[in-house]
Amino acid sequence: YSHWPSCCPSKGQDTSEELLRWSTVPVPPLEPARPNRHPESCRASEDGPLNSRAISPWRYELDRDLNRLPQDLYHARCLCPHCVSLQTGSHMDPRGNSELLYHNQTVFYRRPCHGEKGTHKGYCLERRLYRVSLACVCVRPRVMG
Amino acid sequence: YSHWPSCCPSKGQDTSEELLRWSTVPVPPLEPARPNRHPESCRASEDGPLNSRAISPWRYELDRDLNRLPQDLYHARCLCPHCVSLQTGSHMDPRGNSELLYHNQTVFYRRPCHGEKGTHKGYCLERRLYRVSLACVCVRPRVMG
């Protein structure tokens, strides 16, 4: 990352103006943003959200931490070991494996800030990479050479 | 989000202690973190990263913004309109569609902070939801009822 100047306001600025604005821009809800309410089974549906129509279907599991931003993260959990047949949407095709796709997401943790003499002076945000599973993907198995 | 107290340090705290720590924890590199160097073609490889072994293969496109955290985001771009056959990994099966999976990711933008009289007083972080495409997924086409 390139260096950013300190994001803190200048000395003496009134801290009632919160540095980090929590309001979000209005964005239409997107499929992976919340768990789906379709029946969780190893089948590829012909309607509903992407994770239930996929031939490597998955469900979402909530991971909530009130000291983290974002506070709510969702982890994908595969519903089948193999891919579902495109022909029937219900039988498994063992020629394909359903594998989790992982991603290191940037998150921020609220940590106590310490003053000059180690005293507690409000809160700081600490950036971390956090491993999340995004989706299940149908792949051809690796060929061992 | 539950309300967090102001993340700014108390009045008079030395702002040389940067509020947001940029250092990251060491995390093993994961496949989707960077674009793959495999040939970009509509085929499911038998080796390499997940995005090239998928029967809905995709490439990554860099989206860099130095005034945003994370500064680097990757958008998935599907390499095939349909899924690739599990039989061969190199010919398409029109019974399946390769569709992008979208996600609203929390990002932070650096914005000028304004003091009591509208004067520029350092920088603030503003939270936004940013739409990213995470992967391409092989799905059964929607049946229109």
Partner: antibody
Framework: QVQLQESGPGLVKSSETLSLTCTVS????????WSWIRQPPGKGLEWIGF???????NYNPSLKSRVTFSVDTSKNHFSLKLNSVTATDTAVYYC?????????????????WGQGTLVTVSS | DIVMTQSPDSLAVSLGERATINCKSS????????????LTWYQQKPGQPPKLLIY???IRESGVPDRFSGSGSGTDFTLTISSLQAEDVALYFC?????????FGPGTKVDIK
């Protein structure tokens, strides 16, 4: 009636490149998948790979690093190049057409074969 | 890769008698969604290319005499010649087309006793 005919040199020097062409007559090369298969003298059959008229290929991993297929729809033929040959590449080389199952969108068995051409690798 | 094995390596059968060739795949080649076995049988006579006899394990190719039949499912398959004729003397191969790389059995040589 679809007919396939292999052509190319019958003798290739060790470490050089084996080049063969399969000419298709009695039907179009388009819309089908075309394979190369070889058979060492007195032995079994080995699938080398296939090519589609669009140029999409699939190679046997055992030969992938040395093999290249190409197709010329205007001449209704497809070709094989196998580089860095050794004596173990001595074989009868066949070209064949895959049956294509439009119900499953999958490749079936080989329904038409060429007569085959013997390629000997000499040291 | 899927390994195909055949037994016996060779067999000699009297004219008009039954000949049975077995083929085994190292993994299941039945796809339950279509209930199809991705197995085919070829006949090869000396100096000729292989000729397609049976596909989907049991479907006879057009023009193939009905004395040839295929059976089996999953990993175990059989080619049967119900009444051996002189023109059936040949090498017989099984092949899987379930997944690439497509692989062949080593062959079974059929002779007349």
């Amino acid at each position: 009636q679809v007919q396939l005919q292999e052509s190319g040199p019958g003798l290739v020097k060790s470490s050089e490149t084996l080049s063969l062409t399969c000419t298709v007559s009695g039907g179009s090369i388009s819309s089908y998948y075309w394979s190369w298969i070889r058979q060492p003298p007195g032995k079994g059959l080995e699938w080398i790979g296939f090519i589609y008229y669009s140029g999409s290929t699939n190679y046997n991993p055992s030969l992938k690093s040395r093999v290249t297929f190409s197709v010329d729809t205007s001449k209704n033929h497809f070709s094989l190049k196998l580089n860095s040959v050794t004596a173990t590449d001595t074989a009868v080389y066949y070209c064949a057409r895959h049956y294509f199952d439009s119900g499953t969108y999958e490749l079936g068995p080989f329904d038409y074969w060429g007569q085959g051409t013997l390629v000997t690798v000499s040291s | 890769d899927i390994v195909m094995t055949q037994s016996p390596d060779s067999l000699a059968v009297s004219l008009g008698e039954r000949a049975t060739i077995n083929c085994k795949s190292s993994q299941n080649i039945l796809l339950t969604s279509s209930n199809k076995n991705y197995l085919t049988w070829y006949q090869q006579k000396p100096g000729q290319p292989p000729k397609l006899l049976i596909y989907w394990a049991s479907i006879r190719e057009s023009g193939v005499p009905d004395r040839f039949s295929g059976s089996g499912s999953g990993t175990d398959f059989t080619l049967t010649i119900s009444s051996l004729q002189a023109e059936d003397v040949a090498l017989y191969f099984c092949q899987q087309y379930y997944i690439t790389p497509f692989t062949f059995g080593p062959g079974t040589k059929v002779d007349i006793k």
